[in-house]
């Protein structure tokens, strides 16, 4: 047994529809034959470090990194990825080898990097290093831009790891609110990767290629603004960079800015300050807080304080995975024929969603607007008062969300009739769904007031194309009414509509609309 390797590293590729891939990183089912990654001892390294062969993975592929340890006794372990420690649950296989697994579901850019596994056995300690990268395929991608500080300069670099190479531009605005809309004259665009002018009110970086355009705003706390009722909230995924800018203006230079995380000053190297005089000789100071690759413990309240301004905070939340939070219960609306109305969905999501509105198998563009409370809203007003089912669908890299709406238009029934040898039927799509009456017209009742109750059958059916309800009523023909005129009437709270039918021998039936 001595010549067996102490440690074996394997890669398991899972088929994308493979239901065997569990959410847990303990021991998923093997779906394809494992690929040996070698795991050679790394020379000239302090301690026992094994290095697995580099792993290249397709975007959205699911894999398991697995280590088999042939060592006596119990083992304990810890995974570390981008400075974050991840849960590790070893188990033993039939040959009594310790098995440690890391499942990566739907590979994305943020999951690429070095995975370190620390193993402690009764005999010794090991470190195993896996390097996972995304395979360079011809698939086009467009990644949201992120910021980096330029080495030895007070400037930001905007980076978007996209294929084909995107055009990067800074979008700057120096006024407040609505006037910072994309096409406003207050907006200045600079098609370059490096930005030195970092004192503006609103700073965004956008990247565009054949797939479209993605933007990232520089998260800013402005101490000259009145503190908001709702604390601003910033979401990031583990491994992403954090950038928050604190900005303050004062009549002179006699003030300073500080950043704290949960009441502890940020460590040096996690902030940098810039200041300038504005045109009216007031002093503008900005202080950046930044973390090049966030871990779970970077979550918390980041507070910017000044000796001359009220302090303000932002809640930074680091998540393992993106999310879309919204209520997915379906909603029904009824509106008048000329009433102004919009569907709306309020959601909290990270990363930003891509969305569509769909009606009758036709998709419509979807706009989102950020609200002050950290939520976003998407509205759809272009329904043209067509009743039916409307669907809102949203997705980001990690989550999907669908919500159904039903629109009913209040209107007086419109009746259509059809008949056969044995029965007469009337249909109406008015809303609220109408009730029906059948009346017989005769010498005794020239105004058709004699009600028919026998042989009437009412039903409502869903007209699938638009998801709108149609009500129908059918009268089975009897000897008592054959040869007579009958009238079917549909009525709801908005009015009544009738159709008169002559029940004669088989053949075409004349219908008389009678409103």
């Amino acid at each position: 047994n001595q010549d067996l390797p102490v440690i074996k590293c394997v890669l398991i590729n899972h088929k994308n529809n493979d239901s065997s891939v569990g959410k847990s990183s303990s021991y998923p089912m093997v779906s394809e034959s494992p690929e040996d990654l070698g795991c050679a001892l790394r020379p000239q390294s302090s301690g026992t470090v094994y290095e697995a062969a580099a792993v290249e993975v397709d975007v959205s592929a699911s894999i398991t990194l697995q280590v088999l340890v042939d060592a006596p006794g119990n083992i304990s372990c810890l995974w570390v990825f981008k400075h974050s420690s991840l849960n590790c649950q070893p188990h033993f296989d039939l040959q009594n080898r310790g098995v440690v697994s890391m499942v990566i579901l739907k590979m994305t850019e943020t999951q690429a990097g070095e995975y370190l596994l620390f193993i402690q056995s009764e005999a010794t300690n090991y470190t195993i290093l896996f390097t996972v990268s995304i395979r360079n395929t011809l698939l086009y991608t467009l990644r949201r831009p992120y910021f980096r500080k330029m080495e030895n300069q007070d400037a930001l670099v905007c980076i978007s790891e996209s294929v084909p190479e995107p055009i990067v531009e800074w979008v700057l605005c120096d006024s407040q609110g609505e006037s910072c809309k994309e096409e406003s004259p207050a907006v200045v665009k600079k098609e370059e990767k490096v930005l030195h002018e970092l004192f503006g009110t609103d700073i965004r970086c956008c990247a565009r290629n054949e797939l479209g355009r993605e933007c990232t705003r520089l998260f800013t706390i402005d101490l000259n603004q009145t503190p908001q009722t709702t604390l601003p909230q910033l979401f990031l995924k583990v491994g992403e960079p954090l950038w928050i800018r604190c900005k303050a203006v004062h009549v002179n230079h006699g003030f300073g800015l500080t950043w704290e995380l949960e009441n502890k000053a940020l460590e040096e190297g996690n902030y940098f300050e810039m200041s300038t005089y504005s045109t009216n000789r007031t002093m503008i100071r900005i202080l950046f807080a930044f973390v090049s690759s966030v871990a779970r413990n970077d979550t918390g309240y980041y507070t910017c304080s000044s000796s001359k301004h009220p302090s303000q905070s932002a809640l930074v939340t680091i998540v393992e995975k993106g999310f879309i939070n919204a209520t997915n219960s379906s909603e029904d609306y009824e509106i008048d024929q000329y009433e102004e109305f919009c569907f709306s969905v309020r959601f909290k999501a990270y990363p930003q969603i891509r969305c569509t509105w769909t009606f009758s198998r036709k998709s419509f563009p979807c706009e989102q607007k950020g609200l002050d409370n950290g939520y976003s809203i998407s509205k759809f007003c272009n329904h043209k008062h067509q009743p039916g089912e409307y669907i809102f669908h949203a997705e980001n890299d990690d989550a999907q969300f669908t919500k159904m709406f039903t629109l009913n238009i209040r209107r007086k029934p419109q009746v259509l009739a059809e008949a056969s040898a044995s029965q007469a039927s009337c249909f109406s799509d008015g809303y609220p769904l109408p009730s029906w009456t059948w009346k017989k017209c005769s010498d005794k009742s020239p105004n058709c007031t004699e009600e028919i109750t026998e042989g009437v059958w009412n039903r409502k059916a869903n007209r699938k194309v638009f998801g709108q309800w149609v009500s129908s009523s059918t009268l089975n023909m009897s000897e008592a009414i054959k040869g007579f005129l009958v009238k079917c009437c549909a009525y709801n709270s908005l009015g009544t509509s009738c159709e008169t039918i002559l029940l004669n021998s088989p053949g075409p039936f004349p219908f008389i609309q009678d409103n």
Epitope: L231, N263, T303, S305, P310
Partner: nanobody, 111 residues
Amino acid sequence: QVQLQESGGGLVQAGGSLRLSCAASGVTFSASYIDWYRQAPGNEREWVAQITRGGDSFYADSVKGRFAISRDNAKNTVYLQMNSLKPEDTAVYYCRVLSYWGQGTQVTVSS
């Protein structure tokens, strides 16, 4: 569990004074800055004053010179002394620490 409890509200005549208190628990009080906000019927909640953990105070323009904010770290309490009250000061007053809010105390100023 962070809890904030306001007290000291009531009915007062224009020109009169009130002292509001905000008692905090479940938070490192001395390490936190505290804000007072108020909300009049039909209006948005608006910021009134702040005291930093170092004891510096800041005020909205509408209350400057009339209101004074102070803190007693030993009692985990912040106070808002309101003088020369006006009918437009009528509102529910809330204190806040970070994302945490109290239930509010009603202040009514009659003319």
